[in-house]
């Protein structure tokens, strides 16, 4: 058993049929010694008396808010949550496996630049009685500070018969060094509590591996005289790290016909312009990627040819 | 060329070669993670690699103030990785074909380090750890880790030379 926060405790249980469970001793936070009784949740049934209460925690029915009273007055509370371990593996019932980039990916994180700011998100089908708490650091043995905000519900989607809820959190490294080569990864830890079930999820990454620039901005077409060619130009997204002579991007320019089946013409360039042939009813799209490190491409910025 | 005395390197040549290094490093190891090669016996194998750290002067301001600290750090790293890529880690099994980007990567690391430090000048180099794994799985795990680490190192080096070529070239 360990303390998650003040008056909230997590009991770690091996979860299998007829498991013996864990013996837990609760102590009433009071100077009083006599006349103390214990109850669980809203029940008025007295579970025991005395300054301490010993219970055998085996299932969710044994978890909940234990309260010690004296003469009708509440002295203190202890909330017990369960953390299940099945076949040596901690349960992951609360969050959905996003399966990208690999199986057992519950947390996904992205950064728009090298400033040390990043966003993580996760999915669940649970709509109520759900709380999240997020902590982060750079490195684990001698951790350096990363400050995370509160997790918020950022999107709701309907998937078949189910509703899916996306939560996200923003974090900022306290003393980021954008130009340095990271040697210690960022660690992100999410505590999830659904009713009386506790689970924790972690992710470890370098900012460089989660970089995904915003799409190029101000995408424009300039027809070239007496030609089917156009000059496409664009700019670095505002959110990208500066100076651009140091934090450089590379770009992919694509000409795509109306039909998905039509052959796509692609050009790669380090410049912020390119000359392409604009076909009727086609559109021109540009996306960006770090020039020197193959992290994610941005989403496409697009304009119609006509 | 950068010499310990402090003259400028051939920024544009360094820029071109460092960008080529980035491409080769990703050709040699394009994936972000390797699946079932469990990190057994992974005794801090690549923790001794030289990293370009915050105080090494490789940020735009540091380069403007005095690029020598940063160039020395980059040179140190290039020599370190060049030695690793020429070692038994990369010559033993699993077999690399002669068309492997690792061969070109090895040659390009040497080429860039020579651009930074011509013969007759000596910056101190970091001691390379004696790693001679006997099993193919250990060797492969080390290769992946070294190449991942090299990708990060050459990305910073390429940014330095691109910025230098754009703002510090005479």
């Amino acid at each position: 058993i360990w303390e998650l926060k003040k008056d909230v405790y997590v009991v770690e249980l091996d979860w299998y049929p007829d498991a013996p469970g864990e013996m837990v001793v609760l102590t009433c936070d009071t100077p009083e010694e006599d006349g103390i009784t214990w109850t669980l949740d809203q029940s008025s049934e007295v579970l025991g008396s005395g300054k301490t209460l010993t219970i055998q925690v085996k299932e969710f029915g044994d978890a909940g808010q234990y309260t010690c009273h004296k003469g009708g007055e509440v002295l203190s509370h202890s909330l017990l949550l369960l953390h299940k371990k099945e076949d040596g593996i901690w349960s992951t019932d609360i969050l959905k496996d996003q399966k990208e980039p690999k199986n057992k990916t519950f947390l996904r994180c992205e950064a728009k630049n090298y400033s040390g700011r990043f966003t993580c998100w996760w999915l669940t089908t649970i709509s109520t009685d759900l709380t999240f708490s997020v902590k982060s650091s750079r490195g684990s043995s001698d951790p350096q500070g990363v400050t995370c905000g509160a997790a918020t519900l950022s999107a709701e989607r309907v998937r078949g018969d189910n509703k899916e809820y996306e939560y996200s959190v923003e974090c900022q490294e306290d003393s980021a060094c954008p130009a340095a080569e990271e040697s210690l990864p960022i660690e992100v830890m999410v505590d999830a509590v659904h009713k009386l079930k506790y689970e924790n999820y972690t992710s470890s990454f370098f900012i460089r591996d989660i970089i995904k620039p915003d799409p190029p901005k101000n995408l424009q077409l300039k027809p070239l005289k007496n030609s089917r060619q156009v000059e496409v130009s664009w700019e670095y997204p505002d959110t990208w790290s500066t100076p651009h002579s140091y934090f450089s991007l590379t770009f992919c320019v694509q000409v795509q016909g109306k039909s998905k089946r039509e052959k796509k013409d692609r050009v790669f360039t380090d410049k912020t312009s390119a000359t392409v042939i604009c076909r009727k009813n086609a559109s021109i799209s540009v996306r960006a990627q770090d020039r020197y490190y193959s992290s994610s491409w941005s989403e496409w910025a697009s304009v119609p040819c006509s | 060329r950068a010499v310990p005395g402090g003259s400028s390197p051939a920024w544009t040549q360094c820029q071109q070669l460092s960008q080529k290094l980035c491409t080769l490093a990703w050709s040699a190891h394009p994936l972000v993670g390797h699946m079932d090669l469990r990190e057994e016996g992974d005794e801090e194998t690549t923790n001794d690699v030289p990293h370009i750290q915050c105080g090494d002067g490789c940020d735009p301001q540091g380069l403007r103030d005095n690029s020598q600290f940063c160039l020395q750090r980059i040179h140190q790293g290039l020599i370190f990785y060049e030695k690793l890529l020429g070692s038994d880690i990369f010559t033993g099994e699993p077999s690399l074909l002669p068309d492997s980007p690792v061969g070109q990567l090895h040659a390009s690391l040497l080429g860039l380090s020579q651009l930074l430090q011509p013969e007759g000048h000596h910056w101190e180099t970091q001691q390379i750890p004696s790693l001679s794994p006997s099993q193919p799985w250990q060797r492969l795990l080390l290769r992946f880790k070294i190449l991942r680490s090299l990708q990060a190192f050459v990305a910073v080096a390429a940014r330095v030379f691109a910025h230098g070529a754009a703002t510090l070239s005479p």
Epitope: - | S27, A28, H29, P30, L31, H34, M35, D36, L37, E93, P94, S95, L96, L97, P98, D99, S100, P101, V102, G103, Q135, P136, W137, R139, L140, L141
Partner: antibody
Amino acid sequence: EVQLLESGGGLVQPGGSLRLSCAASGYTFTDQTIHWVRQAPGKGLEWIGYIYPRDDSPKYNENFKGRATLSADKSKNTAYLQMNSLRAEDTAVYYCAIPDRSGYAWFIYWGQGTTVTVSS
Amino acid sequence: EIVMTQSPATLSVSPGERATLSCKASRDVAIAVAWYQQKPGQAPRLLLYWASTRHTGIPARFSGSGSRTEFTLTISSLQSEDFAVYYCHQYSSYPFTFGGGTKVEIK
């Protein structure tokens, strides 16, 4: 698009010779090794060796050394497998293949194969 | 040379069912193993490399696992187009060698 096209198969007498060709297109011919793999009827795959056209250096499976000769003609973007002293057990479909660019020999591109029958 | 032993030689499975193919190397090959699918009259087609990395365009129902000497190819839900012969291949050591193949047939 990378394409490999084998030719030169056919019926050969035991003890005879044969030269198979593999015409490559869609990539820089000198950049990658070209491998030869064969498959006897109803049997598995057997690696014969490779040629690296950049420096014409071959590497052979010891089981084929002395009987197989690998070469390449850079001007024609074509690799060759010369097989001598053929026996009935050399009857097989012969494939050329090229591996991934990372320098490890998993084979991404294969030719359609050319059939060699050794029989009197 | 490294001997790659595949089992079973033939696997009879109904469409929609799961197929598990095994491949054992006679010595450590790390994860330098590829899997190929071959249909009659066609060249082999690459499915996986590094024991578990799917090649471009290969459906997610194909997955691989294992390291050093024991490897598995799993087809989670067999489609009609998956009935074929499957070969494992080690590219760790010269000469590169292939397993004898597992024929996956309709039950």
